[in-house]
Interface confidence: low
């Protein structure tokens, strides 16, 4: 349905509060280095303009596209060239090239200081003094650090952020009330950002067919009672929503997401029995709830898949008539029967099935050729099952920190060219799979673990794309989305790698170690561990364990000393010398 003024249409649909929030997020995700005040000024100008268009859709410039309006506004920033360098060249382009240019300059690892949490009283005062500015600042700070954050979901986070302050700033013990809520929001926010980044990578690097396949598998697991046609409709709508958000079309994305939530709630009977409690909630909460809804129960009497997909003589005819629909139906049928499989495994099975049909439908006896296709699935299923089993055993044996260290060593040996901060970040997150998934019942472990690992490995791929240093990483990241995790799992010690020269400064520690939080201490130690492996890639587990145990003892000793700095100065070189000897 066409509108004379797109900006007026979206303003009326979304309402002023959501409109302003989404425009602020959009601008902050594009111009990540701009000061807060500059963005607020731009947002206010766009909002005032939108109001004039609501009053009169025929007013000057109201017929322009949102990309044109927003792009023109971004290009008025005076310091664009100094702050963003070549991104300023985008402004010389016409739409749609200009928006594509802005998108290409989004920085997944912006050089921004980590967010420091002020004292609770300071935050509560700021919240009470100017609630609107306080919440805008939250949107701005998160959006500029996470340029692909799912914008309508970020509005939901902001609403929870506001609720936390409104409740806790009145509490007797403000800190006890507020800090756990902020920790939860931070952790959930990081997870949400990473999940969305994978969706955008899937769409941008592998196309909407890849995203649709992912969505068919996931929605079929969630809604096993829904018909294939119903799942297909949801997949089409969901693909549109995420394509828009990943493309920077945040107003359209939020509007379409609201429409999708409305549709799902109006058609619960044909989708899932689990939607009811979501549908009673207000919009932002409702959309979030629907996205996170648990899997519905599987219908009791689902027939064997073999009849339609192996035993039938019409397999090749059905495949030839409409390949994508036939494969989509296969994926739907397989996924709704297997909530215990990861989405990535289901996609590998569909890919294997497609490859078998491509080969067999051209053979002399197609039926004979594809008769054993399900047997070929067995090794594909067993590989992630075994991986989860082994890694959960290791996690239970070692605990999270040492499990992370085992992964740090494993991944540094695989891809030692990758920067140390990236290896530490990625391995620490890979290690969190243990606490997240290993405590779950058997039937939920694989979907939890492998789909989480896909999200974490996508972060590695995204960071590596910015500064490529390893052909092996490039290969695993670009060849196949569904095989990324098996590709990384299969990597061995890089024999071609020339060990990094020993640099004593890397292993120089100071008294400030003692005042760090437990997490910061772990990161310091893990950074040293990566550097050790880069220096001695063939070091054994035992050797590395010995060095790390000595390191922990050395830090503990010096942190107990009266003159900590002197202790680090005197014991540090001894630790370095002993470590070099132990690894010689």
């Amino acid at each position: 349905d066409t509108h004379k003024s797109e900006v007026a249409h979206r303003f009326k649909d979304l309402g002023e509060e959501h409109f302003k929030g989404l425009v602020l997020v959009a601008f902050s995700q594009y111009l990540q280095q701009c000061p807060f005040e500059e963005h607020v000024k731009l947002v206010n100008e766009v909002t005032e303009f939108a109001k004039t268009c609501v009053a009169d859709e025929s007013a000057e410039n109201c017929d322009k596209s949102l990309h044109t309006l927003f792009g023109d506004k971004l290009c008025t920033v005076a310091t664009l060239r100094e702050t963003y360098g070549e991104m300023a060249d985008c402004c010389a382009k016409q739409e749609p090239e200009r928006n594509e240019c802005f998108l290409q300059h989004k920085d997944d690892n912006p050089n921004l200081p980590p967010l420091v949490r002020p004292e609770v009283d300071v935050m509560c005062t700021a919240f009470h003094d100017n609630e609107a500015t306080f919440l805008k600042k939250y949107l701005y700070e998160v959006a500029r650090r996470h340029p692909y954050f799912y914008a309508p979901e970020l509005l939901f986070f902001a609403a929870r952020y506001k609720a936390a302050f409104a409740e806790c700033c009145q509490a007797a013990d403000k800190a006890a009330c507020l800090l756990p809520k902020l920790d939860e929001l931070r952790d959930e926010g990081k997870a949400s950002s990473a999940k969305q980044r994978l969706k955008c990578a899937s769409l941008q690097k592998f196309g909407d067919r890849a995203f649709k396949a992912w969505a068919v598998a996931r929605l079929s697991q969630k809604f096993p009672k829904a018909e294939f046609a119903e799942v297909s409709k949801l997949v089409t709508d969901l693909t549109k929503v995420h394509t828009e958000c990943c493309h920077g079309d945040l107003l359209e994305c939020a509007d379409d997401r609201a429409d999708l939530a409305k549709y799902m709630c109006e058609n619960q009977d044909s989708i899932s029995s689990k939607l009811k409690e979501c549908c009673d909630k207000p919009l932002l909460e409702k959309s979030h709830c629907l996205a996170e809804v648990e899997n519905d129960e599987m219908p009791a009497d689902l027939p064997s898949l073999a009849a339609d997909y192996v035993e039938s003589k019409d397999v090749c005819k059905n495949y030839a008539e409409a390949k994508d629909v036939f494969l989509g139906m296969f994926l739907y049928e397989y996924a709704r029967r297997h909530p215990d499989y990861s989405v990535m495994l289901l996609l590998r099975l569909a890919k294997a099935y497609e490859a078998t049909l491509e080969k067999c439908c051209a053979a002399a006896d197609p039926h004979e050729c594809y008769a054993k296709v399900f047997d070929e699935f067995q090794p594909l299923v067993e590989e992630p099952q075994n991986l989860v089993k082994q890694n959960c055993e290791l996690f239970e044996q070692l605990g999270e920190y040492k499990f992370q260290n085992a992964l740090l060593v494993r991944y540094t040996k695989k891809v030692p060219q990758v920067s140390t901060p990236t290896l530490v970040e990625v391995s620490r997150n890979l290690g969190k799979v243990g606490a997240k998934c290993c405590k779950l019942p058997e039937a939920k472990r694989m979907p939890c673990a492998e789909d989480y690992l896909s999200v974490v490995l996508n972060r590695l791929c995204v960071l590596h794309e910015k500064t490529p240093v390893s052909e092996k990483v490039t290969k695993c990241c670009t060849e196949s989305l569904v095989n990324r995790r098996p590709c990384f799992s299969a990597l061995e010690l890089d024999e071609a790698y020339v060990p990094k020269a020993f640099n004593a400064e890397t292993f120089t520690f100071h008294a400030d170690m003692c005042t760090l939080s437990e997490k910061e201490k772990q990161v310091k130690k893990q950074t040293a561990l990566v550097e050790l492996v880069k220096h001695k890639p063939k070091a054994t587990k035992e050797q590395l364990k010995g060095v790390m145990d000595n390191f922990a003892a050395f830090v503990e000793k010096c942190c107990k000393a009266d003159d900590k700095e002197a202790c680090f100065a005197e014991e540090g070189p001894k630790f370095v010398a002993a470590s070099q000897a132990a690894l010689a």
């Epitope: 004593a504 120089t508 005197e570 540090g572």
Partner: nanobody, 116 residues
């Protein structure tokens, strides 16, 4: 060959000042952290202060904090130690080292005596 030549020591009254220098050669000076160490007769060497390769991170033993200042000139391949408010207990032989090691290597050291 790596060489470190210390200079600037001498006799000074309590409360006085001295500036020690360490001229380095034979290695990429700007790539290495450097330290000053002192040794009392018959005692183990004691770390005094360190500075990183770029010169933007300095560290001090508690006993000299606020009185001594370490710096470097990478263009001149030279390390310095500005010593103010000197006390009798600062009397020792001072020498520079590469990195954070307190073990003396390839350096003669320079004697500092604080006495009235």
């Amino acid at each position: 060959a790596v060489q470190l030549v210390d200079s600037g020591g001498g006799l000074v009254q309590p409360g006085g000042s001295l500036r020690l220098s360490c001229a380095a050669s034979g290695f990429s000076f700007g790539s290495f952290g450097m330290s000053w160490v002192r040794q009392y007769p018959g005692k183990e060497p004691e770390w005094v202060s360190s500075i990183n390769g770029r010169g933007d991170d300095t560290r001090y033993a508690d006993s000299v904090k606020g009185r001594f200042s370490i710096s470097r000139d990478n263009a001149k391949n030279t390390l310095y130690l500005q010593m103010n408010s000197l006390k009798p207990e600062d009397t020792a032989e001072y020498y520079c080292t590469i990195g954070r090691s307190v073990s003396r290597s390839r350096t003669q050291g320079t004697q500092v005596t604080v006495s009235s």
